[in-house]
Interface confidence: medium
């Protein structure tokens, strides 16, 4: 599949305030009940290997993870937070449906595999790993697709 | 055996109200998110309203915001639906399913249990 | 809201032979999407989730295929009990599912 532009968010995504708070305390209530403070998820291993232009469609394969396997199963947590930032999550991911890459994805699928493993191995303080960092997916997705 | 079973439906006058329950077993219901669909007489399906394993999230369809309500009561394995200020539209099959959930295996992802229904008519 | 149309909406199928069903999204819902079957009176049943993995107790003729915004579904050669209403659903907007009008099913 061609390289094409759906790999792409609109700035105003990022640009509205209320969201962008739920989002950030969302991040900080999680992170306050994380205790493994010697892993990080998202951070420059994450990217290694990994040109810029593809970088938002590695950034979509985070998000589609978060979403799935952590924010979904844990939804009852961190209200009133979670209710409000998972559709708005839930939005960015259908506005990255179409995003592809062409030629060899194998570093990105190995990057998000290691992270997915990573946060299976945590098992649920894991997950609430994956949660504390969500002011960083919301960051890198910025960084990546705008 | 993995079951869903409503109850409660009935005739109401527009603006009445009405609360319907579904009581489940076989399952451990306080592990899985539960949904009400709605289906009108010769229609389709039509979400309704979905509540997070614990109660601690819900989220309602547009059309029913602020008049339908759904909770659970996990010591008793049921589900409802309240039903305030009914109107003619609101005439249908309210069906509730096992939606969202974690077992040991996988994340469950779909409406894969339903009950048999219970039928609101909403008609002066 | 995602918008669901499924396609046509009264199919006419010999018993035994192949009947295809198909559903598009008015945007991209991945992979994300359920196929039921509703017999009258009775309840939906799951029978396809994720686009292509069977539910349990789907029999193997059913199968499930598309991506994005176009899907199928297939029923390789009809039984009698196949005969029935057939809906789509997204879970990609979660938790804002929409179904599609469905289709109708019916012995040719």
């Known amino acids: 599949l061609p390289v094409n532009t759906r790999c792409k968010l609109e700035v105003s995504n990022f640009q509205q305030p209320y969201i962008v708070n739920r989002t950030f305390m969302l991040a900080k209530e999680a992170s306050l009940a994380d205790n493994n403070t010697d892993v990080r998820l998202i951070g420059e291993k994450l990217f290694r290997g990994v040109s810029a232009k593809d970088q938002c469609y590695l950034m979509k394969q985070v998000l589609n993870f978060t979403l799935e396997d952590v924010l979904l199963p844990q939804s009852d947590r961190f209200q009133p937070y979670m209710q409000e930032v998972v559709p708005f999550l839930t939005k960015l991911s259908n506005q990255l449906s179409s995003c592809h890459i062409s030629g060899d994805d194998q570093n990105i699928q190995k990057n998000v595999r290691r992270l997915k493993e990573t946060v299976k191995k945590l098992g649920e303080s894991g997950e609430i790993k994956a949660i504390g960092e969500l002011d960083l997916l919301f960051m890198s997705l910025r960084n990546a697709c705008v | 055996e993995v079951q869903l079973l409503e109850s409660g439906g009935g005739l109401v006058q527009p603006g009445g109200s009405l609360r319907l329950s579904c009581a489940a077993s076989g399952f451990t219901f306080s592990t899985y998110a539960m949904s009400w669909v709605r289906q009108a007489p010769g229609k389709g399906l039509e979400w309704v309203s979905t509540i997070t394993s614990s109660g601690g999230a819900t989220y309602h369809a547009d059309s029913v915001k602020g008049r339908l309500t759904i909770s659970r009561d996990n010591s008793k394995n049921t589900l409802y639906l309240e039903m305030n200020s009914l109107r003619v539209e609101d005439t249908a099959v309210y069906y509730c399913?096992?939606?969202?959930?974690?077992?040991?295996?996988?994340?469950?992802?779909?409406?894969?249990?339903w009950g048999q229904g219970t039928l609101v008519t909403v008609s002066s | 809201e995602i918008v669901m149309t499924q396609s046509p909406a009264i199919l006419s199928v010999s018993p035994g032979e192949r009947a295809t069903l198909s559903c598009r999204a008015s945007?991209?819902?991945?992979?994300?999407l359920a196929w039921f079957q509703q017999k009258p009176g009775q309840a939906p049943r799951l029978l396809i989730y994720?686009?292509?993995k069977r539910a349990t107790g789907t029999p193997a003729r059913f199968s499930g295929s598309g991506s994005g915004t176009d899907f199928t579904l297939t029923i390789s050669s009809l039984e009698p009990e196949d005969f029935a209403v057939y809906f789509c659903?997204?879970?990609?907007?979660?938790?804002?599912?929409?179904f599609g009008q469905g289709t109708k099913l019916e012995i040719k």
């Open positions: 994720d686009t292509s």
């Open positions: 945007q991209s819902v991945s992979n994300y």
């Open positions: 399913a096992k939606d969202w959930g974690r077992t040991v295996y996988a994340v469950i992802k779909d409406l894969d249990i």
């Open positions: 659903q997204q879970r990609s907007d979660w938790p804002q599912y929409t």
